[in-house]
Interface confidence: low
């Protein structure tokens, strides 16, 4: 018996061929011997089966001795043995219809789980293998689960159902809702304007939700809400903002925040959360601010950084075009009785300068100038 695999919602064509290359009488029946369709001369006739409105044939092929049964908009319950009676012979075809669906929604938040459920006819024992857009293979039976979805899982998942050494392939488009970056860091000199950007890694027609930026300043004992906002059809409106600092927010996507001045008391880390309409859970992006200050007080030239610096970062003080006078894996360095000239304070990572602040040291009878 020939086995044909079909996909729920698709169209399948079951073939039936006579030895004579001409139009002769044929019938298609199901396993209960109920007629589905056949012919009367050159006319298509239909029987009382439940496939009535979804069954068809190709009259253009009858003259060649081919009498296919076409079933449109396949359902799982269409799985059956179909019998073609032509001349004195019977051809049997077993049709197995499968469906593969994603849990509730194909737009999922980063970190959520994706469950793919296979619908299969009774008595079948299929195996399923799915390949994610990043090339990860998962195998299973009736259900396949992927926990902790990552941004790279966005795209087309290709799933192959195997039954009786035959294959049918499903393609499911999954969108992982996330920010482009999980974490970012901004390095600024004291007094500079700070721009924070939170680009999303997906595009949808309408985007509605609400968000908040919580900030943990290094000098503060607890975190504080800096701004709350609403998002309606990609338009941003601020609901509430602290007086200090007075953040400004862009009205369009990508989400964009401006801090008028980088000050030591603002150095620290923020957590921007975005709750999307009709989604459980929130999107998160961490943002970090490191602030540098170079000062000269009497005979002491000091360079300090505040904020989340990694233990491997180097802070240095050097006179322009000279070797560093002091370099430490610390958050403050200083030089006593500095020579006159342009001094540079550098925050660097393996030789790469992340932040630089210059301060002019004048001969001792003058006051310092900040460029």
């Amino acid at each position: 018996k020939k086995v044909v695999l079909g996909k729920k919602g698709d169209t399948v064509e079951l073939t039936c061929t006579a030895s004579q290359k001409k139009s002769i009488q044929f019938h298609w029946k199901n396993s209960n011997q109920i007629k589905i369709l056949g012919n009367q001369g050159s006319f298509l006739t239909k029987g009382p089966s439940k496939l009535n409105d979804r069954a068809d044939s190709r009259r253009s092929l009858w003259d060649q001795g081919n009498f296919p049964l076409i079933i449109k908009n396949l359902k799982i319950e269409d799985s059956d043995t179909y019998i073609c009676e032509v001349e004195d012979q019977k051809e049997e075809v077993q049709l197995l219809v499968f469906g593969l669906t994603a849990n509730s929604d194909t737009h999922l938040l980063q970190g959520q789980s994706l469950t793919l459920t296979l619908e299969s006819p009774p008595g079948s024992s299929p195996s399923v293998q799915c390949r994610s857009p990043r090339g990860k293979n998962i195998q299973g039976g009736k259900t396949l689960s992927v926990s902790q979805l990552e941004l790279q899982d966005s795209g087309t998942w290709t799933c192959t159902v195997l039954q009786n050494q035959k294959k049918v392939e499903f393609k499911i488009d999954i969108v992982v809702l996330a920010f482009q970056k999980a974490s970012s860091i901004v390095y600024k000199k004291e007094g500079e304007q700070v721009e924070f950007s939170f680009p999303l890694a997906f595009t949808v027609e309408k985007l509605t939700g609400s968000g908040e930026l919580w900030w943990q300043a290094e000098r503060a004992s607890s975190s504080k809400s800096w701004i709350t906002f609403d998002l309606k059809n990609k338009e941003v409106s601020v609901k509430r903002v602290t007086q200090d600092p007075k953040l400004q927010m862009g009205k369009k996507l990508p989400l964009h925040l401006t801090l008028p001045q980088a000050l030591p008391q603002y150095a620290g880390s923020g957590n921007l959360t975005l709750a999307l309409e009709a989604k459980t859970g929130k999107l998160h992006q961490e943002v970090n601010l490191v602030v540098m200050r170079a000062t000269q007080l009497q005979k002491n030239l000091t360079c300090e950084v505040w904020g989340p610096t990694s233990p491997k970062l180097m802070l240095s003080l050097k006179l322009e075009n000279k070797e560093a006078k002091v370099s430490k894996r610390e958050k403050a360095v200083w030089v006593l009785n500095p020579e006159a000239g342009m001094w540079q304070c550098l925050l660097s990572d393996s030789g790469q300068v992340l932040l630089e602040s210059n301060i002019k040291v004048l001969p001792t009878w003058s006051t310092p100038v900040q460029p």
């Epitope: 998160h284 961490e286 970090n288 989340p308």
Partner: nanobody, 117 residues
Amino acid sequence: EVQLVESGGGLVQAGGSLKLSCAASRSILDFNAMGWYRQAPGKQREWVTTIARAGATKYADSVKGRFSISRDNAKNTVYLQMSSLKPEDTATYYCNARVFDLPNDYWGQGTQVTVSS
């Protein structure tokens, strides 16, 4: 080099509570996230909970509702309050500190928690 020192482990009856501490040798706000992991004999080390620098917390399903992570920035210490303890919570608990631009995490030496039935 950063030092993380755990304390507070011990033997406790099922249903009881314990509070673990993790003291860091530098400001805990220099870390991207701090958290706790545990390792039972003959098993892989598993993640328990994390507190991000900005205060967001996450928990493994197995401890949700029973364990709570907190921190004291002034003391550079992270805490793990464990209640309704079960025998399957028996493990060595490790404190972990993560810096976003470093490939390696910092780990403490671990503190043993034993829950008897």
